[in-house]
Amino acid sequence: RAPRCRELPAQKWWHTGALYRIGDLQAFQGHGAGNLAGLKGRLDYLSSLKVKGLVLGPIHKNQKDDVAQTDLLQIDPNFGSKEDFDSLLQSAKKKSIRVILDLTPNYRGENSWFSTQVDTVATKVKDALEFWLQAGVDGFQVRDIENLKDASSFLAEWQNITKGFSEDRLLIAGTNSSDLQQILSLLESNKDLLLTSSYLSDSGSTGEHTKSLVTQYLNATGNRWCSWSLSQARLLTSFLPAQLLRLYQLMLFTLPGTPVFSYGDEIGLDAAALPGQPMEAPVMLWDESSFPDIPGAVSANMTVKGQSEDPGSLLSLFRRLSDQRSKERSLLHGDFHAFSAGPGLFSYIRHWDQNERFLVVLNFGDVGLSAGLQASDLPASASLPAKADLLLSTQPGREEGSPLELERLKLEPHEGLLLRFPYAA
């Protein structure tokens, strides 16, 4: 008799793929543009990335450090009107892209939450949640919550408002903290909160360290849904050298939870390569004309246009991973088992019932390594086969689709492999 199928978990839209943050409309659009109408014209690009949600803004009126002149219900006219916003919402909906609005109040000021009048600000947020939910927004983000006194209780209240409207609505909180205990205390009182933090931001050193961070986090958070990013707002290049970007893309897309990226992560956008550009929001490189300040500073392979035409580019890798993440059951909601693969390596399996299974092997080191996959670490339900097909490598030169013997697996420096193998009873 065939074994019974495992019951599928309830999946919310943010469980099904990546979120894409556009914190600075002007930097994202470039060329002196930077409004909601212009963003609407970029939705096809977001569709091509297969992202499930757009985390937008903040775009509300905020006079720096002035509570009275901060209005979370009014769109800053520099970004457009309510009509523009509504039009963006409708267009995004047609393309199955959800819109999450950042309501971090004092985004132009020193302290994101103002240093005084906490209750006044919290009431403004409550009003804004209700207003924008009724206007059709799919969720909200609030950042820098380490600056918000009694953050846990406010987040619980805002979560109740968000979920009270519809279980299909999302609240994301962001913190600069990388401390697991602080992160857990924020999560404790907020069941469905998605939290972005700097927890993984110092993980770039070794595979063992990354494995330790990831497994500690997953063990500590139990069954709850996680999000994966390196910070609450900044680009991957703020934390990682260029040679690790592909590795991290592969990891973020294949860990159990929602991957969260900032605009430009998909092309390796790096403020340091663009003199005069702010670290937190450099101009998006659509093509070589996007950064006219210094002629020749931008080459084609740094841009969306150039990378779109190159199947071996970071952007092409991002699109492939995003596509896999959104359609494979084992990556959507599969179980996760990390196991030993040797020093410098981080490896894990994703599997769901009788669906195709995935093996991820990541070499964080700058030397080539042979992987000694310790299958004995794995439960019987997640055993390794002798061979697995190579779905993709982060490095060029491997023949995709070819079966690889897992006992003889060798990885290049900074290489990540995504392998697939069938369920075997």
């Epitope: 979370l72 219900l73 009014q74 309510k82 509504d86 006044t120 009431t123 804004a128 009724q134 299909d168």
Partner: antibody
Framework: QVQLQESGPGLVKPSETLSLTCTVS????????VHWIRQPPGKGLEWLGL???????NYNSALMSRVTISKDTSKNQVSLKLSSVTAADTAVYYC?????????????WGQGTLVTVSS | DIVMTQSPDSLAVSLGERATINCKSS????????????LTWYQQKPGQPPKLLIY???TRESGVPDRFSGSGSGTDFTLTISSLQAEDVAVYYC??????????FGQGTKVEIK
């Protein structure tokens, strides 16, 4: 119990500014929003604006350049100012509480105050 | 702005009989986010302020007699008084309660006793 009471001059000259106050009791202005609505004699209702618990304001765009809503939470008062009035602004003016989460419905209303614009 | 149109303008119904008031909006008032319909009904008796009867198209406000019911979705709505009482003589208004301001009212329907 919840109460709202409008007050202000019953007669205003054309081109002047109409000023009304809504005094509330039985609830806090830091927890509920307050709408202003008007009704010309023998006619229907027209929504003017809403001031939220946190102080944000939505206005009827048809009157936006002339209407100002504010509040003094410590006095439990919401005020409405309408500038450059004409005879067409003659109406009973009501304040009403925004009573439900995820709805702009008005669950409690003041008795209304008649304002006549005439020289 | 959303335009609300009520019909009929006035209605005469015998005591104990059913009264039906219609309201049409110029665009759908269904919020796909929570599947609620953002339409509100008020009753205004002579010399009094309006009174909230129904919100979300069919949710009766507490204290409102169950002879009042609201129905409809999208753009077409109905307020029904199942058995008209003398105290129900009033003008009834529908209001768009949807999304962005202004939250406009219908022109009103006057209900009298035949």
């Amino acid at each position: 119990q919840v109460q709202l009471q409008e007050s202000g001059p019953g007669l205003v000259k054309p081109s002047e500014t109409l000023s009304l106050t809504c005094t509330v009791s039985g609830f806090s202005l830091t927890s509920y929003g307050v709408h202003w609505i008007r009704q010309p004699p023998g006619k229907g209702l027209e929504w003017l604006g809403l001031i939220w618990a946190g102080g944000s304001i939505n206005y009827n765009s048809a009157l936006m350049s002339r209407v100002t809503i504010s509040k003094d939470t410590s006095k439990n008062q919401v005020s409405l100012k309408l500038s450059s009035v004409t005879a067409a602004d003659t109406a009973v003016y009501y304040c009403a509480r925004k009573g439900h989460m995820y709805s702009y419905a008005m669950d409690y209303w003041g008795q209304g105050t008649l304002v006549t614009v005439s020289s | 702005d959303i335009v609300m149109t009520q019909s009929p303008d006035s209605l005469a119904v015998s005591l104990g009989e059913r009264a039906t008031i219609n309201c049409k909006s110029s665009q759908s008032l269904l919020n796909s986010g929570n599947q609620k319909t953002y339409l509100t009904w008020y009753q205004q008796k002579p010399g009094q302020p309006p009174k909230l009867l129904i919100y979300w198209a069919s949710t009766r406000e507490s204290g409102v007699p169950d002879r009042f019911s609201g129905s409809g979705s999208g753009t077409d709505f109905t307020l029904t008084i199942s058995s008209l009482q003398a105290e129900d003589v009033a003008v009834y208004y529908c209001q768009n309660d949807y999304s962005y301001p202004p939250w406009t009212f219908g022109q009103g329907t006057k209900v009298e006793i035949k």
